[in-house]
């Protein structure tokens, strides 16, 4: 007896983090025997969408012409062949930015920091939020979460880095979010350039890979040291 049908592959173009109003295409790739593709969104009535396969029948396209809150969430896809439905794909998390006003990102004491010293990146929102995310451009694992322990909302989150090395240098942005949907993020903050001076080691060029790419051993996220700031926020690496 044949085993279960292989699970399809699910991905989004141009990526899985999309600004409000922009278009995104979700692709589901199965096998040449596929007769129909189905996309399901977590916590929504199923099927979310159904599409006939594109020639040569091994994939289907699900188009979102204009990103809104309704489309943000966690997706899986399936395909139907003559012998039945496939296993579900691995999940795709589609995140929308632009749901809230942009926070402000600053560096304390300064964005110009000497290697070996400490710096704290401060993300501040005008309205209270319970999740803050720090993103470093071109990092393979760009997300660092600070999330409220008990739903207590905060106007800011601190991301301490100590001791600073040349690897910490680069361009950062932060986002804020409400816990009721971590698929909805604020507009990004204006970029903050962190410049590390006085280092004897050569700065490594940051790999130009997409957010969704798996990290290699040299691209692991930098864990800030020190205790969690006294803000009721808990640190999560994603």
């Amino acid at each position: 007896q044949a085993g279960p049908l292989p699970k399809p592959t699910l991905w989004a173009e141009p990526g899985s983090v999309i600004s409000w109003g922009n278009s995104v295409t979700i692709w589901c790739q199965g096998t040449l025997e596929a007769r129909e593709y189905r996309l399901d969104k977590e916590e929504s009535p199923a099927p979310w969408d159904r599409q006939n396969p594109l020639e040569p029948k091994n994939k289907a396209r699900f188009s979102i012409p204009s990103m809104t809150e309704d489309y943000a969430g966690r997706y899986r896809c399936y395909y139907r062949s003559p012998v039945g439905w496939s296993q579900p794909s691995d999940p795709l998390e589609l995140v929308m930015t632009g749901a809230y006003s942009k926070p402000t990102l600053s560096a304390l004491p300064s964005p110009l920091v000497t290697s070996g010293k400490s710096v704290t990146l401060l993300c501040q929102s005008r309205s209270p939020m319970d999740t803050f995310l720090l993103i470093k451009e071109r990092a393979a694992h760009p997300l660092l979460h600070l999330r409220s322990e008990h739903g207590a909302q905060q106007h800011q989150a601190e991301f301490p880095m100590s001791p600073v090395t040349s690897v910490h240098g680069g361009t950062y942005r932060c986002f804020s979010s409400h816990g009721f949907s971590h698929y909805l993020l604020s507009h990004p903050s204006d970029p903050l350039e962190l410049i590390v001076s006085g280092s004897l080691e050569d700065p490594r060029p940051s790999p130009t890979r997409s957010v969704s790419t798996a990290a290699g051993p040299e691209d692991q996220p930098l864990m800030p040291t020190g205790s969690v700031p006294h803000s009721g926020l808990r640190r999560h690496w994603e």
Epitope: D40, K41, E43, S44, P45, A46, P47, W48, D49, R50, D70
Partner: nanobody
Framework: EVQLVESGGGLVQPGGSLRLSCAAS????????MGWYRQAPGKQRELVAA???????KIGDSVKGRFTISRDNAKNSVYLQMNSLRAEDTAVYYC???????????????WGQGTQVTVSS
């Protein structure tokens, strides 16, 4: 061939209840989200409720806490239970079927003919 057939509409007093039914062909029912829209005179069509093959539901904000939707797989039918009815619930109620994303876009694949609900004393 009519593929979605509604029933259960009528005249009811404010505060009363009605249960709408929609029978579908098996091929439509088994693979689609089923739901209800309504359209009052001079107003835009509004999504009232929807239920998926996974039994997860979406209830419109204006009827939350008063209306519930359910589906009976054995009978290929979907039901809209309407409680605490108000005058503003007066409308033609349409059964619909399709993928859920098309419910959000107000363009399901299949529509019923509609059944009139009038809430008046």
């Amino acid at each position: 061939e009519v593929q979605l057939v509604e029933s259960g509409g009528g005249l009811v007093q404010p505060g009363g209840s009605l249960r709408l039914s929609c029978a579908a062909s098996e091929s439509i029912f088994s693979s689609n989200v089923m739901g209800w829209y309504r359209q009052a005179p001079g107003k835009q069509r509004e999504l009232v409720a929807a239920v998926g093959i996974n039994r997860l539901t979406k209830i419109g904000d204006s009827v939350k806490g008063r209306f519930t939707i359910s589906r009976d797989n054995a009978k290929n039918s979907v039901y809209l239970q309407m409680n605490s009815l108000r005058a503003e619930d007066t409308a033609v109620y349409y059964c619909a079927a399709g993928a859920y994303v098309r419910f959000l876009q107000y363009s399901p694949d299949y529509w019923g003919q509609g059944t009139q609900v009038t809430v008046s004393s």
